[in-house]
């Protein structure tokens, strides 16, 4: 799927509102919150496939997010307000369904969604970025790694 | 200040039903997960159930599981549990407890607890 | 699911510095938090994740973790320190449920 055309500041809204909540629920009270960021994305629709990738396609270790609340509301948010984005995600629910379930690690999982707040951060640091070029065209936009 | 007051604990018979409550006061009830947690006389503290910030999300002590119902309403500052089926071995102080609020998850505000008894 | 050990009772000299464990597998994966419980009363946080002390608590109680086992210390112990003392934390088989240890009775004599 294309993220292109998605209403961008609707989606931060839904992720300040809800899903920011979820995910650092989910990491609450463990020891691993300094996971190291090996995911990165570069502008917002970019953040949005690794966000969608990492959300709903199930590793080895750590197949169970998608049922998540977050993973629930993200899907909800994405289909809202990413035009056509619910057609897609017809066929690849059903594929999903298709594959073995796997062993979950807690501590992959929790890795994982170590990442995926990173890169949602990422995905309003780009937004700003953007907004902010619009009100000052000298803004020189450059990536803080 | 910051408050939880538990209510609706009261006698009953082995197989019946009931309906606990607990008025949040003083704080953004929405903003937190919330915690049922009982202590048997004499006995030590046993997590019942959690409930997400807003009750999307619900589990439950394996001891409890399809007997119990989490619930809340953000609304009214309140959280429920209603308790079918009881067991002589539910008989408790039920406690409700605040819980994790980001990155930090303990429980940091209960109530005084509020008695039920299991008893033919 | 997972379980929390506690010793059942631990005993220290009023002033002398105690310490409380709890073992267990989610504590590799989850922080511990302790409450304390005295007669008749509802518990009370006293310490939470790494080492975070909720305000209103002497900085006398403090934690701290390795592996499998986290600890709470008490420095300088007081007679109002004696009562039951909690360990939980997050489940490590279900990361959604919630584990309490079995309780230490913290006499200070």
């Known amino acids: 799927y294309d993220f292109t055309n998605c209403d961008f500041q609707k989606i931060e809204a839904d992720y300040l509102r809800t899903i920011s909540k979820d995910l650092i629920t989910y990491m609450s009270g463990t020891k691993s919150t300094d996971f190291n960021n090996t995911v990165s994305c570069s502008n917002r629709p970019h953040c949005l496939t690794e966000i969608q990738s990492l959300t709903f396609n199930p590793t080895p270790r750590c197949a169970s997010l998608a049922k998540e609340m977050f993973a629930r509301k993200t899907k909800a948010t994405l289909a809202l307000w990413c035009p056509g984005y619910s057609e897609t995600q017809i066929n690849a629910t059903q594929a999903m369904k298709k594959r073995r379930k796997r062993k979950v690690t807690t501590n992959k999982c929790l890795e994982q969604v170590s990442q995926l707040l990173g890169l949602w951060r990422r995905f309003i640091r780009t937004l700003l970025k953007q907004q902010h070029h619009h009100h000052h065209h000298d803004y020189k936009d450059d990536d803080d790694k | 200040e910051v408050q939880l007051v538990e209510s609706g604990g009261v006698v009953v018979q082995p197989g019946g039903s009931l309906r606990l409550s607990c008025a949040a006061s003083?704080?953004?009830?929405?903003?937190?997960?919330m915690h049922w947690v009982r202590q048997a006389p004499g006995k030590g503290l046993e997590w019942v159930s959690l409930?997400?910030?807003?009750?999307?999300?619900?589990y439950y002590a394996d001891s409890v599981k399809g007997r119990f119902t989490i619930s809340r309403d953000n609304s009214k500052n309140s959280l429920y549990m209603q308790m079918n089926s009881l067991r002589t071995e539910d008989s408790a102080l039920y406690y409700c407890?605040?819980?994790?609020?980001?990155?930090?998850?303990?429980?940091?505000?209960w109530g005084q607890g509020t008695t039920v008894t299991v008893s033919s | 699911s997972s379980e929390l050990t506690q010793d059942p009772a631990v005993s220290v000299a009023l002033g002398q510095t105690v310490r409380i464990t709890c073992q267990g597998d989610?504590?590799?994966?989850?922080?511990a938090s302790w409450y304390q419980q005295k007669p008749g009363q509802a518990p009370i946080l006293v310490i939470s994740?790494?080492?975070n002390r909720p305000s209103g608590i002497p900085d006398r109680f403090s934690g701290s973790s390795s592996g499998n086992t986290a600890s709470l210390t008490i420095t300088g112990a007081q007679a109002e320190d004696e009562a039951d003392y909690y360990c939980?934390?997050?489940?490590?088989?279900?990361?959604?449920?919630?584990?309490f240890g079995g309780g230490t009775k913290l006499t200070v004599l």
């Open positions: 407890a605040r819980g994790p609020y980001y990155y930090f998850y303990g429980m940091d505000v």
């Open positions: 003083g704080f953004t009830f929405d903003d937190f997960t």
């Open positions: 409930i997400s910030w807003d009750g999307g999300s619900t």
């Open positions: 989610s504590l590799r994966t989850y922080y």
């Open positions: 994740d790494k080492n």
């Open positions: 939980n934390s997050r489940d490590s088989s279900d990361n959604h449920l919630v584990v």
